[in-house]
Interface confidence: low
């Protein structure tokens, strides 16, 4: 049974004679008259087992002492620390030539842990040990023991274990303690990587490369490596680990972010408090959940506050000009905490009798600068129908509006367009052509914008180039133009009139009268 003694963390003790309780029982040769096991008191009055020999009067001493088998435990190099006292030969009368002040240290590697005899020729000499301090008779009287400490190392070792031996050649020695140990680089954590206990290399200059493993809840950034030096010190840390998302470094560990905190990426250094309007109720959160009614857009970073759709635009003003409307408004009171606000225009055409019966305006209406994604707070809407009720909604939108489309985000106004002149006539056709007449027909304008009172036909000879033209008016959508010259090209234009005035003339229709009495019937815009 061994008692525990405290040694440096980088030393692993294989044998410590001072920790053994009871007899050491090492093997001595010769069995009698050489090394002898003696119990003495140490500086704390604790009994310790020592081996002593003091055959200084007799010549040719060869006294051997061998330890029990010492396991190697994977060490390739071991260290032997010997604490001993040695008597000064000059203080002993009449021992000149026989008294020595050194002893020899040997080792022998073996896989056999039960060798009973000392075979001197098997042992390999490690060194001759001399004392730095020797004591005299006076010192003994004053109970001053001059303790020497010598350390030697041996390696590389390869067998399961080994024996140590001490050879006395005629000195007066007390082996107070023998400790055998090897050196390791102790388990350590550097840069969030754990490096295991590592036994040092076989020789005193070797470095052992060790790959570290990332601590719990961390991941490799660069492969973590260190070198274990021969003295049991870690050298040259390379690479590192990073705490996973949801974890941060605390006291060399990766601990989960506390509730109310988060860490989105392993490359972030520490957990951050949840941004405004968000929370986390799990430890180890990698993102925070938005409060009810708040949202994150797809491209919002986890560090951004959660935001809301904006409130409705304010102060919507309309200005009707015949079949055009100009709308202006003010920014919403609450932008929802975002900068990416824009506006969409919704146009609804509503029945005069029942304003609740509305339907979309369709593609014929035009918006300047645009209908959706407006960055300005005004829009011009044209090509509306006259005498019609319209409802215009202005929607304020931002990057999170799609998550919660809410009527509170829009403001609306209802207007009635004024009387306006009709639009131009799209299609005029020559239905019959004779020597002296042309029968014309046309379609109603796309947008009459009211009741059409009459149509006006303007015509002239093509080579007169509108210098001399004639007008014919009719309430119908067709008319016969008579009194024309034969074999002559004429140009015809038609326009409609309402109470609001004339519309634009149609595109020119060119027709050539005939030379023969018979009639020619045509549909084209340029009948000949």
């Amino acid at each position: 049974v061994t008692g525990s003694r405290v040694y440096p963390a980088n030393e692993v003790t294989l044998l410590d004679s001072r920790s053994v309780q009871g007899e050491l029982g090492w093997i001595a040769s010769p069995l009698e008259g050489g090394w002898e096991e003696v119990s003495i008191m140490d500086e704390k009055n604790t009994p310790i087992r020592t081996y002593q020999v003091c055959n200084v009067m007799e010549p040719s001493q060869n006294n051997w002492l061998r330890t029990d088998w010492i396991t190697r435990e994977g060490a390739q190099r071991v260290y032997i620390e010997i604490k001993f006292t040695l008597r000064d030969c000059n203080s002993l009368p009449g021992v000149m030539g026989t008294c020595k002040e050194t002893f020899n240290l040997y080792y022998y590697e073996s896989d056999n842990d039960k060798e009973r005899f000392i075979r001197e020729n098997q042992f390999v000499k490690i060194d001759t040990i001399a004392a730095d301090e020797s004591f005299t008779q006076v010192d003994i009287g004053d109970r001053i023991m001059k303790l020497n400490t010598e350390i030697r190392d041996v390696g590389p070792l390869s067998k399961k274990g080994f024996y140590l031996a001490f050879q006395d050649v005629g000195a007066c020695i007390a082996l107070v303690s023998v400790r055998v140990f090897y050196k390791k680089c102790p388990l350590t954590v550097r840069n969030l990587a754990q490096f295991p206990d590592t036994i040092t290399g076989a020789d005193t200059s070797s470095l052992v490369e060790v790959r570290g493993s990332c601590v719990n809840n961390s991941e490799e950034k660069d492969v973590p490596k260190m070198y274990c030096g021969a003295d049991g010190e870690w050298l040259v840390p390379i690479g590192n680990c990073l705490c996973n998302a949801g974890h941060e470094e605390r006291s060399g560990e990766c601990q989960a972010c506390k509730i109310g905190y988060y860490k989105a990426l392993s490359t972030d250094a520490t957990c951050a408090k949840c941004p405004p309007h968000s929370y986390s109720v799990w430890e180890g959160a990698t993102s925070c959940t938005c409060d009810r009614g708040f949202f994150r857009a797809d491209n919002d970073a986890a560090s951004m506050p959660c935001t809301r759709p904006p409130s409705a635009p304010l102060n919507l003003i309309s200005n009707v000009n015949e079949t055009s409307v100009n709308l202006e408004w003010s920014s919403p009171q609450n932008t929802g905490g975002r900068q990416d606000i824009s506006y969409n225009v919704v146009c609804k055409k509503c029945g005069a009798g029942d304003p609740s019966k509305c339907r979309p305006c369709g593609s014929g209406v035009h918006y300047t600068p645009q209908q959706n994604g407006l960055k300005t707070t005004k829009v011009s809407i044209t090509d509306l129908l006259a005498h019609t009720n319209y409802t215009f909604e202005i929607w304020a939108v931002n990057g999170v509006s799609k998550y919660n489309p809410n009527p509170d985000q829009s403001v609306s106004v209802t207007v009635t367009t004024n009387q306006a002149a009709p639009s131009s006539i799209a299609l005029v056709q020559a239905k019959e052509v004779t020597r002296y007449s042309v029968a014309l027909a046309w379609l109603e304008p796309d947008r009459p914008n009211g009741v059409i009172l009459e149509y006006e036909v303007k015509y002239y000879e093509k080579d007169q180039n509108e210098r001399s033209y004639r007008i014919v008016r009719t309430a119908a959508r067709n008319t016969d133009i008579k009194g024309l010259n034969p074999l002559t090209s004429y140009v015809f234009h038609v326009r409609a009139r309402t109470a609001a005035g004339y519309g634009d003339f149609s595109e020119p229709l060119e027709v050539t009268t005939n030379t023969v009495p018979s009639r020619i019937i045509g549909d084209g815009a340029n009948s000949t």
Epitope: A245, I259, V281, W282, T286, S287
Partner: antibody, heavy 120, light 110 residues
Framework: QVQLQQSGPGLVKPSQTLSLTCAIS??????????WNWIRQSPSRGLEWLGR?????????DYAVSVKSRITINPDTSKNQFSLQLNSVTPEDTAVYYC??????????WGQGTLVTVSS | QSVLTQPPSVSAAPGQKVTISCSGS????????VSWYQQLPGTAPKLLIY???KRPSGIPDRFSGSKSGTSATLGITGLQTGDEADYYC???????????FGGGTKLTVL
């Protein structure tokens, strides 16, 4: 509407492995706002949380200390399901096993439950 | 032995009010949200209350939750025979790094 459908044997022999699967519809096992849990219930133990799997840019697992050495919970993204494996079972593991979705520390959707009896 | 402590049973007449307590510690109820579950015989538990006092859609406002310090309470007013069930509280335990439940309370409507 989220639904969880459990499947797996109701009888397991002692020392063998208990295996159950939970198929998800109406949500994704890879959702980054939910965790997918296994919970069991027995007269002696009451409701006992066993563990969960969840995805937050990578997969994570958390397990109860009482079963940590024996439990594995795996997601299967291709089938949108997750599974429970409990090794070296004993009669003490006899219970009704539930899968459940955890959204912010409350279990808002549960599977129908599977009674697993450990007996030879 | 459950981490959270609930009374084994409570009872009241139809139309009456009943409360069920759930006691824990600072590592669970004290620093985390509490949820409550109703388990009708032969069925899976059903979420009644989350985040201490919020009701999922479809849960009538007869059910309410509250939390104070390291204890939480479930309240049920206007008791109905259909409310006869087992009720469980649950929360996260920061020390155990696990979800923990109470032992359950059997509600009897007299």
């Amino acid at each position: 509407q989220v639904q969880l459908q459990q499947s797996g044997p109701g009888l397991v022999k002692p020392s063998q492995t208990l295996s159950l699967t939970c198929a998800i519809s109406g949500d994704s096992v890879s959702s980054n706002s939910a965790a997918w849990n296994w919970i069991r219930q027995s007269p002696s133990r009451g409701l006992e949380w066993l563990g969960r799997t969840y995805y937050r840019s990578k997969w994570y697992n958390d397990y109860a200390v009482s079963v940590k050495s024996r439990i594995t919970i795996n997601p299967d993204t291709s089938k949108n399901q997750f599974s429970l494996q409990l090794n070296s079972v004993t009669p003490e593991d006899t219970a009704v096993y539930y899968c459940a979705r955890d959204s912010l520390r409350s279990f808002d959707y549960w599977g129908q439950g599977t009674l697993v009896t450990v007996s030879s | 032995q459950s981490v959270l402590t609930q009374p084994p049973s409570v009872s009241a007449a139809p139309g009456q009010k009943v409360t069920i307590s759930c006691s824990g510690s600072s590592s669970n109820i004290g620093n985390n949200y509490v949820s409550w579950y109703q388990q009708l015989p032969g069925t899976a538990p059903k979420l009644l209350i989350y985040d201490n006092n919020k009701r999922p859609s479809g849960i009538p406002d007869r059910f309410s939750g509250s939390k104070s310090g390291t204890s939480a309470t479930l309240g049920i007013t206007g008791l109905q025979t259909g409310d006869e069930a087992d009720y469980y509280c649950g929360t996260w335990d920061s020390s155990l790094s696990a979800v923990v439940f109470g032992g359950g309370t059997k509600l009897t409507v007299l």
